[in-house]
Amino acid sequence: AITEAREEAKPYPLFPGPFPGSLQTDHTPLLSLPHASGYQPALMFSPTQPGRPHTGNVAIPQVTSVESKPLPPLAFKHTVGHIILSEHKGVKFNCSISVPNIYQDTTISWWKDGKELLGAHHAITQFYPDDEVTAIIASFSITSVQRSDNGSYICKMKINNEEIVSDPIYIEVQGLPHFTKQPESMNVTRNTAFNLTCQAVGPPEPVNIFWVQNSSRVNEQPEKSPSVLTVPGLTEMAVFSCEAHNDKGLTVSKGVQINIKAIPSPPTEVSIRNSTAHSILISWVPGFDGYSPFRNCSIQVKEADPLSNGSVMIFNTSALPHLYQIKQLQALANYSIGVSCMNEIGWSAVSPWILASTTEGAPSVAPLNVTVFLNESSDNVDIRWMKPPTKQQDGELVGYRISHVWQSAGISKELLEEVGQNGSRARISVQVHNATCTVRIAAVTRGGVGPFSDPVKIFIPAHGWVDYAPSSTPAPGNADPVLII
């Protein structure tokens, strides 16, 4: 058996004297009782302890013997009051009581801190009958004590609806300090003070705390638990832990990393998800956040065509969802696109630039200076125009679409002609005489058909009339562009 240097209740012989009204020799079997199961407890304590005042409940028996002598009051015998032992050791303690034989069916229950102990606990009750009384010994054993076994244990017995309660047996399990609060990892601003907390408990108390930074002790003198370490500020990452010391030894907390917040790393993998004539949808993979959450991102768009100005457009967006649609771009243009993101410390560098192109769109303006005139000799209508400015073509011109509507009494028909992009004139056959021809022209790219020009009207006379002058797109302010020849 293992004995402790600090036992408050010294181990007594298991049964130092005979039970009242019986002879020691009558009870020789009791000497082997604790070992009947083969279990060797680390500490064994006597159910009686002479000279110690009795504080348990007492039951006064109402029944008298043949000689009519009143029976002595029933009470648990004095026992050891306080057991101190180390974690993982075994312990056995017991309650004993002598009960007159007139009482039947007596049972003893064990309670800890006010709650009955049921089930899995190792409790054994042994009965030793004699002529007048039965000695009852209730043993409670724990093979490997843990901190959770700390507490006040009592025995209870019910007789005549009366409850007899033993004195408490206090079990104190001592061990290495146990952390109730350990330092937590933190992300801190450079050169800014912060606190770390460490708390550990026994028993035994007191528990003293030493702080460790990057394997070196911070405080020369220990602090009583709980301890708060104020770090005035760091310039680089550090690992902190705390040591908790008590009489049993020391326990070291987990090491926690204290990171210094920094600007984020630049985003990576900027990629083009989709392109239209005037917008580009991009996505990116955020870089390392610098130990501080991203707040927002900036998309920088730079004209990249060989002779473009290089104008820079900046679009701000939220950090999530790493996706942005860049709008208001020119069609069929090249752009360099970069992404930068920020946290509370500042902006990251710009991601590697990627080249992106918008697609062709339909022209945004109509052909200019549309002129229409009648060539009576060939019975044709000649149409001339100027192509839209390059920047507003929004793509490579593939041709023009000409709408000509012929209206005379009771007749109206629209015809569409497609002409190639080379040249800026077309000739259409007269469809109806003595009618008005209304001409409109739209430029066409692979991106689609642009807007039609303002209508230009010309009157086609009956055969034999003279061809005088052309009709053309009106100057601003002219209400009606009809010219009757």
Epitope: P306, S308, N309, G310, S311, S336, V350, T390
Partner: antibody, heavy 117, light 107 residues
């Protein structure tokens, strides 16, 4: 009013280096590409490369790789072109140019670099 | 790299005459051709930019046409003040490349 100021001339010895400057004013320096063009006396024009002051992105003519290095100083709105290991072939007028609306609209007055022993 | 072949190298015309300069490119550049005028001791000046667009303030006697690989620059009614070197510049792709130039003189 957009202006690109260049020193009129630089005289350098063969094998040496020269750093030609171009101070920009009258516009947002970081918002436009800056191009450099070479013109040998009585000859045509050659495009050397361009740099964007916003982020110092450069596009170089392979012919001038290792010969010309383009840099900018945003604080003074100045673009620089360093020419190294100079030979008589490098004697020329060097222009800084910025494009606007699809053409080389603004030119510096040019710096005549003469390589002579 | 797109090479630009400009012709003629020089020409001499009387005032009032028409001048035609041609540039041919080795790749299809769409309409990304520019035309520059350079007078002695001065930097070049842009006359016509991409898409045959006449620059603001440039007299209408200057014009250009062409698409793809063949481009023509024209001066109608040449004046004595038009004496200069003329260059074409393709701006479709990098590196930018210039024509070798045409020296215009007045007879």
């Amino acid at each position: 009013q957009v202006q690109l100021q260049q020193p009129g001339a630089e005289l350098v010895k063969p094998g040496a280096s020269v750093k030609v400057s171009c101070k920009a004013s009258g516009y947002t320096f970081t918002n436009y590409w800056m191009h450099w063009v070479k013109q040998r006396p009585g000859q045509g024009l050659e495009w050397i490369g361009r740099i964007h002051p916003f982020d110092t992105e450069t596009n170089d003519n392979q012919k001038f790789k290792g010969k010309a290095t383009l840099t900018v100083d945003k604080s003074s709105s100045t673009a620089y072109m360093q020419l190294s290991s100079l030979t008589s072939e490098d004697s020329a007028v060097y222009y800084c140019v910025i494009p606007a609306n699809g053409g080389f609209a603004y030119w510096g007055q040019g710096t005549l670099v003469t390589v002579s022993a | 790299e797109t090479t630009v072949t400009q012709s003629p190298a020089s020409l001499s015309v009387a005032t009032g005459e028409k001048v035609t300069i041609r540039c041919i490119t080795s790749t299809d550049i769409g309409d990304d051709m520019n035309w520059y005028q350079q007078k002695p001791g001065e930097p070049p000046k842009v006359l016509i930019s991409e898409g045959n667009s006449l620059r603001p303030g440039v007299p209408s006697r200057f014009s250009s046409s062409g698409y793809g690989t063949d481009f023509v620059f024209t001066i109608e009614n040449t004046l004595s003040e038009d004496v200069a070197d003329y260059f074409c510049l393709q701006s479709d792709n990098l590196p930018l490349t210039f024509g070798s130039g045409t020296k215009l003189e007045i007879k």
